[in-house]
C-alpha cells in the first residue's frame, strides 16, 4: 500500500544517480529511486536519483505530470536504471498538459 507507514528500519535501495545533486557519484542509496524530467527554458533536463527519506519522496512521487515536469518513482535496487520520465501525451487525463512524444 502506498500510504503505509514506513517500517522502523526501512529498506534502502541502490539507485542510479544522474543530475545536479549527484556530485561525482553515479549512484545513491535511499528508500525510493526516481527518474525525472524538467523543462528548463524549453530544454529537457533528465535526472535520476533517490529519496533518502520516505516522506520526502511520497509527495513528489504522487504529483501528476505537468507541462514542465514529470517524475517516476520506484522501489528496488537499480529500479530507475531503465526508467525515463516522460511528459504526458494527448489523451492522458492530465488537464492543461502538452502534446509531446518521444521519437
Amino acid at each position: 500500500m502506498e500510504d503505509e507507514k514506513p517500517k522502523v528500519n526501512p529498506k534502502l535501495y541502490m539507485c542510479v544517480c544522474e543530475g545536479l545533486s549527484c556530485g561525482n557519484e553515479d549512484h545513491c542509496e535511499g528508500q525510493q529511486c526516481f527518474s525525472s524530467l524538467s523543462i528548463n527554458d524549453g530544454f529537457h533536463v533528465y535526472q535520476k536519483g533517490c529519496f533518502q527519506v520516505y516522506e520526502q519522496g511520497k509527495m513528489t512521487c504522487k504529483t501528476p505530470p505537468s507541462p514542465g515536469q514529470a517524475v517516476e518513482c520506484c522501489q528496488g535496487d537499480w529500479c530507475n536504471r531503465n526508467i525515463t520520465a516522460q511528459l504526458p501525451t494527448k489523451g492522458k487525463s492530465f488537464p492543461g498538459t502538452q502534446n509531446f512524444h518521444l521519437e
Epitope: N40, D41, G42
Partner: antibody, heavy 118, light 106 residues
C-alpha cells in the same frame, strides 16, 4: 533529411518590427520543441527563445522578453519569431534550431540576417 | 544566469596536433553541456552532447569530458577541416553559450 529554412530577415529601422519564419521538413514537426538562436556580427551565440510542441509554453531570454514573440503553426510545419521594438543590438543572424528530447540543438537552419539601422 | 568561460579564446595549431579546449561553468551544470563547431558564414554544427556523447556522423577524433563545472573538448589529431570556432553550451538553467574558441592554422 531534417531541413530548417529561415526567411524574413532584412533591414529595419530602430523601433520597427519584423517577422521571421522557419519552415521545417524531414521530421514530424509537431513532436518537437523549436528554438531561435542569434549571433551578432563577429560575436558569439545567444539563445533567444523556445517553444513547446503545441505552442502552449514559450520561453525567452531576458534581452528580448516583452519585445519578441515565438509561435508555431503545426499545420504549416513553421515556427515564427515576431520581433517588435527592434534595437541596434538586435542586429544578428537568426538561426532556427530543433532538439530531440535528449539532444539539445541537434539541427540548425542556415540563418537569416536581421539588420537594425537608421 | 550561469556564465560559461571558454579558454583559450584562440589558438594556433598544426595538422596532426592534439587540441584541447576547456569550458568552465560558474556553477554546477552536471553534464548538461554540448559542444558546437562553426565555420565562417555557416550554421553551428553539433559535435558532442551531454558532455561526452558523440553526435551521429561526427568523427571519433572529437571527444568530450567533464561534469559539474569543468569540461573539455579534445581533438585527438587536428585535420584541415577542423579549423573553425568552437562553442560550449549549457542548458541546465538559463541556457548560455561560451564566448568561443577560434582554432587557427599555425
Amino acid at each position: 533529411e531534417v531541413q530548417l529554412v529561415e526567411s524574413g530577415g532584412g533591414l529595419v529601422q530602430p523601433g520597427g518590427s519584423l517577422r521571421l519564419s522557419c519552415a521545417a521538413s524531414g521530421f514530424t514537426f509537431s513532436n518537437y520543441y523549436m528554438y531561435w538562436i542569434r549571433q551578432a556580427p563577429g560575436k558569439g551565440l545567444e539563445w533567444v527563445s523556445s517553444i513547446n510542441t503545441d505552442g502552449g509554453s514559450t520561453y525567452y531570454a531576458d534581452s528580448v522578453k516583452g519585445r519578441f514573440t515565438i509561435s508555431r503553426d503545426n499545420s504549416k510545419n513553421t515556427v515564427y519569431l515576431q520581433m517588435n521594438s527592434l534595437r541596434a543590438e538586435d542586429t544578428a543572424v537568426y538561426y532556427c534550431a530543433k532538439s530531440t528530447p535528449n539532444i539539445p540543438l541537434a539541427y540548425w537552419g542556415q540563418g537569416t540576417l536581421v539588420t537594425v539601422s537608421s | 544566469d550561469i556564465q560559461m568561460t571558454q579558454s583559450p579564446s584562440s589558438l594556433s595549431a598544426s595538422v596532426g596536433d592534439r587540441v584541447t579546449i576547456t569550458c568552465k561553468a560558474s556553477q554546477n551544470i552536471y553534464k548538461y553541456l554540448n559542444w558546437f563547431q562553426q565555420k565562417p558564414g555557416k550554421a553551428p554544427k553539433l559535435l558532442i552532447y551531454y558532455s561526452n556523447s558523440l553526435q551521429t556522423g561526427i568523427p571519433s577524433r572529437f571527444s568530450g569530458s567533464g561534469s559539474g563545472t569543468d569540461f573539455t573538448l579534445t581533438i585527438s589529431s587536428l585535420q584541415p577541416e577542423d579549423f573553425a570556432t568552437y562553442y560550449c553550451f549549457q542548458y541546465s538553467s538559463g541556457p548560455t553559450f561560451g564566448q568561443g574558441t577560434k582554432v587557427e592554422i599555425k
